[in-house]
C-alpha cells in the first residue's frame, strides 16, 4: 500500500523558519504534489505549494521555496513573519497524486517538545486518504 510521510522541522539557526519534508512510498509515478496547512486539501486546508515533476513548482506566502528533493520527495521552506510562531501549532498536509494509485495524503506537525533543528518522525498522521 502506498504511504505518504511528513516531517516538520524548525531551523536551528532561525526560529522563525520551518521546513516541511514529504515523501511518497509507493510504486507509482507522481503526477502532482500539493502542500496545505490547517488541514487536508479540500477539507479546510489552505494550499501553500503545488509541485509538478515536469511543469515546475509554485509556492505562495508564507511559503518561501518549494523544491523536489528526489523523484518521490519534496521540501517546502516557510518563513514566519509574525512575532509569535503560528507554525509551531499548525498541521501541514502533503497530498501526492500518482498513477495508477490515485491520491494519498498525510499530515504532520512540529512535535510540542521539539528543539530547534529536530524534526518530527517520518510517521504519517492517520489522515491517510485515497481518493
Amino acid at each position: 500500500t502506498p504511504e505518504v510521510w511528513v516531517q516538520v522541522q524548525m531551523e536551528a539557526t532561525e526560529l522563525s523558519s520551518f521546513t516541511v519534508h514529504c515523501g511518497f512510498l509507493g510504486p507509482g509515478s507522481i503526477s502532482l504534489v500539493t502542500v496545505s496547512w490547517g488541514g487536508p486539501d479540500g477539507a479546510g486546508g489552505t494550499k501553500l505549494a503545488v509541485l509538478h515533476p515536469e511543469l515546475g513548482t509554485r509556492q505562495w506566502a508564507p511559503a518561501r521555496q518549494a523544491r523536489w528533493e528526489t523523484q518521490s520527495s519534496i521540501s517546502l521552506a516557510l518563513e514566519d513573519s509574525g512575532a509569535s510562531s503560528p507554525f509551531a501549532n499548525t498541521t501541514f498536509c502533503c497530498k501526492f497524486a500518482s498513477f495508477p494509485e490515485g491520491s494519498w495524503e498525510s499530515c504532520g506537525s512540529l512535535p510540542p517538545s521539539s528543539d530547534p533543528g529536530l524534526s518530527a518522525p517520518p510517521t504519517p498522521v492517520p489522515i491517510l486518504r485515497a481518493d
Partner: antibody, heavy 114, light 113 residues
Framework: EVQLQQSGPEVVKPGASVKISCKAS????????INWVKQSHGKNLEWIGD????????NYNQKFKGKATLTVDKSSGTAFMGLRSLTSEDSAVYYC???????WGQGTTLTVSS | DIVMTQSPSSLSVSTGEKVTMSCRSS????????????LAWYQQKPGQPPKLLIY???TRESGVPDRFTGSGSGTDFTLTISSVQAEDLAIYYC?????????FGGGTRLEIK
C-alpha cells in the same frame, strides 16, 4: 475541460485605472490558480504574476509590482487584475492562464490613449 | 531574472520540410532533485492565445502531434518539427518554468513558403 473567459476590450485615458476579469469554469487539479501575462506589440510575452485562490496570496514579477494588483473571488471562480497609473506602455493584450499555462483565456486588449 | 534567447527570430520553410529552432537560458533549468528540466514551448497562431506544446523540455502536451519534438537539457534546448504542415504557421516561444519570474523567449516566427 477548463475554460477561461476574459472581460472585453478596454480603452482608457492615461493616468486612469482598469480592472480585467477572468472567469474559470470546468475542473482542474490545481483549482483556479491563475497567471497573468502581458503581450506587447503582438510578440513579447511577460509574466506578471499569479494568485492563489485559497488565501489570495500573490506572486509578482518585480517589474509589475505597484502596477498590477491580483485578486480572486473563489466563490465565483473569477480572478481579477487591476492596473493603475496607466500609460501608453501599458497598451497590450493581457491573458490569464491556469497555473501551469496549459489553458489560456482569449485575451483582453487594453488601449491607453488620450 | 533568467534571460531566454531564441534563434532564429524567423524562418521560412516549405511544407514537408524539417525545421529546428533553438532556445538558450542564462541559467540552468535543470532541477537537481528530480533531474527534470523546467522548460516549456508554446505555439501562438495569429489572433489566438499561446498554446502549450511541450513541457519538461521534452514531454508533449496531450493532443500535440508527434511531429513536434522537444530536446535539450540545462541551458540549451531545441524544438523540432519533423515535417512542417501549413497549419504550423505561428510564433513559437520557449519559457523558463524553473524560477520566478517565469520569463519567455522573444519567439521564433515560422513562415510557410
Amino acid at each position: 475541460e477548463v475554460q477561461l473567459q476574459q472581460s472585453g476590450p478596454e480603452v482608457v485615458k492615461p493616468g486612469a485605472s482598469v480592472k480585467i476579469s477572468c472567469k474559470a469554469s470546468g475542473n482542474t487539479l490545481t483549482d483556479y490558480f491563475i497567471n497573468w501575462v502581458k503581450q506587447s506589440h503582438g510578440k513579447n510575452l511577460e509574466w506578471i504574476g499569479d494568485i492563489n485562490p485559497d488565501n489570495g496570496a500573490g506572486n509578482y514579477n518585480q517589474k509589475f509590482k505597484g502596477k498590477a494588483t491580483l485578486t480572486v473571488d473563489k466563490s465565483s471562480g473569477t480572478a481579477f487584475m487591476g492596473l493603475r497609473s496607466l500609460t501608453s506602455e501599458d497598451s497590450a493584450v493581457y491573458y490569464c492562464a491556469t497555473l501551469y499555462f496549459d489553458y489560456w483565456g482569449q485575451g483582453t486588449t487594453l488601449t491607453v490613449s488620450s | 531574472d533568467i534571460v531566454m534567447t531564441q534563434s532564429p527570430s524567423s524562418l521560412s520553410v516549405s511544407t514537408g520540410e524539417k525545421v529546428t529552432m533553438s532556445c538558450r537560458s542564462s541559467q540552468s533549468l535543470l532541477n537537481s532533485g528530480n533531474q527534470k528540466n523546467y522548460l516549456a514551448w508554446y505555439q501562438q497562431k495569429p489572433g489566438q492565445p499561446p498554446k502549450l506544446l511541450i513541457y519538461g523540455a521534452s514531454t508533449r502536451e496531450s493532443g500535440v502531434p508527434d511531429r513536434f519534438t522537444g530536446s535539450g537539457s540545462g541551458t540549451d534546448f531545441t524544438l523540432t518539427i519533423s515535417s512542417v504542415q501549413a497549419e504550423d504557421l505561428a510564433i513559437y516561444y520557449c519559457q523558463n518554468a524553473h524560477t520566478s519570474p517565469y520569463t519567455f523567449g522573444g519567439g521564433t516566427r515560422l513562415e510557410i513558403k
